[in-house]
Interface confidence: low
């Protein structure tokens, strides 16, 4: 049977096949893919911008930052306000004070400890 390079197309992940000769072809890959048949998802994590211990997670032509609990935002640069998330973070009338990367309790009436429970 007659071999037609682009029928069926050997290009995957949405790549477009172009016949370059009687028995040769070229795949034009969609952004985010590479390889002779567009089989590889390009790693988008080198030189990533994830900060404050955020972990880069590769996607298709993009990446996401998986942030530790104290940080949020696209690049984990926005501080999570734990005082809003945990209204009862401080016990016994203590006042919650949000800080970069965490929070602290200002205790009253002789109470002490991280959450004013001692």
């Amino acid at each position: 049977s007659l071999y037609v390079p682009c029928a069926p197309s050997p290009c995957v992940n949405g790549g477009t096949c172009r016949q370059t000769g009687d028995f040769t072809f070229e795949c034009n890959c969609l952004p985010g893919f590479e390889g002779s048949t567009c089989e590889r998802n390009i790693d988008d994590c080198p030189n990533h911008r994830c900060q404050n211990g955020g972990v880069c997670v590769d996607g298709v032509n993009t990446y996401n930052c998986r942030c530790p609990p104290q940080w949020t935002g696209q690049f984990c640069t926005e501080d999570v306000d734990e005082c809003l998330l945990q209204p009862n973070a401080c016990q016994n009338g203590g006042t919650c004070a949000n800080r970069n990367g965490g929070y602290g309790c200002v205790c009253v009436n002789g109470w002490s400890g991280d959450d004013c429970s001692e």
Partner: antibody, heavy 119, light 110 residues
Framework: SLEESGGGLVQPGASLTLTCTAS?????????MCWVRQAPGKGLEWIAC???????TYYASWAKGRFTISKTSSTTVTLQMTSLTAADTATYFC??????????????WGPGTLVTVSS | AYDMTQTPASVEVAVGGTVTIKCQAS??????LAWYQQKPGQPPKLLIY???TLASGVPSRFKGSGSGTEFTLTISGVQCDDAATYYC????????????FGGGTKVEIK
């Protein structure tokens, strides 16, 4: 657009600070800003980059210690240079990358500022 | 680390011809490579990024290919306006690197 300023004629051993001013965008969008230089008749030489969302810096191995890149506002980046020698004579370009996944692909360049080190 | 070597240093090509410029990385950089065009008295202009993606407004006669350590910039149907110096640049790593850029290739038109 980008525009460099602060270049000129300086004596060997002197210090100089170059400023790159951005207009039409701000660094809060997550761009990296870099400095690249070019000696007369020579090729492009990378100096340093700064990740504007965090302040993290990257330097060419030869530039560490004598060059300092800083973000001084949401639209300005500086390059401080110390102990200048004739070998530092070059046009200094400021460049901006494409942001996020286009890290260090320099889509935008300033026209450059000439620094001449001579006695 | 990640030194970029460009060849040839200069090349002469006739109008309508094809020119091929090669760039070799000392270590694998995946597809993290850009090509720039620079004319005298001007800043560089981004032509191709991610090894093969054409930058906005760049004519289709410019083509980038390769991955790993071997990369090629091909200019087909060369025009007088293509006379310039071309640079490759790795964007894979900025740690312990002397220069992101290759040494450049000057393209002259016959």
């Amino acid at each position: 657009s980008l525009e460099e300023s602060g270049g000129g004629l300086v004596q060997p051993g002197a210090s100089l600070t170059l400023t790159c001013t951005a207009s039409g965008f701000s660094f809060s969008s997550g761009y990296d800003m870099c400095w690249v230089r070019q000696a007369p008749g020579k090729g492009l030489e990378w100096i340093a980059c700064i990740v504007t969302v965090s302040g993290n810096t990257y330097y060419a191995s030869w530039a560490k210690g004598r060059f300092t890149i800083s973000k001084t506002s949401s639209t300005t980046v500086t390059l401080q240079m110390t102990s200048l020698t004739a070998a530092d004579t070059a046009t200094y370009f400021c460049a901006r990358d494409g942001g996020f996944t286009d890290t260090w692909y320099f889509h935008l360049w300033g026209p450059g500022t000439l620094v001449t080190v001579s006695s | 680390a990640y030194d970029m070597t460009q060849t040839p240093a200069s090349v002469e090509v006739a109008v309508g011809g094809t020119v091929t410029i090669k760039c070799q990385a000392s270590e694998s950089i995946g597809s993290y490579l850009a090509w720039y065009q620079q004319k005298p008295g001007q800043p560089p202009k981004l032509l191709i990024y991610r090894a093969s993606t054409l930058a906005s407004g760049v004519p289709s006669r410019f083509k980038g290919s390769g991955s790993g350590t071997e990369f090629t910039l091909t200019i087909s149907g060369v025009q007088c306006d293509d006379a310039a110096t071309y640079y490759c640049q790795q964007t894979y790593s900025g740690a312990g690197v002397d220069n992101l850029f290759g040494g450049g290739t000057k393209v002259e038109i016959k």
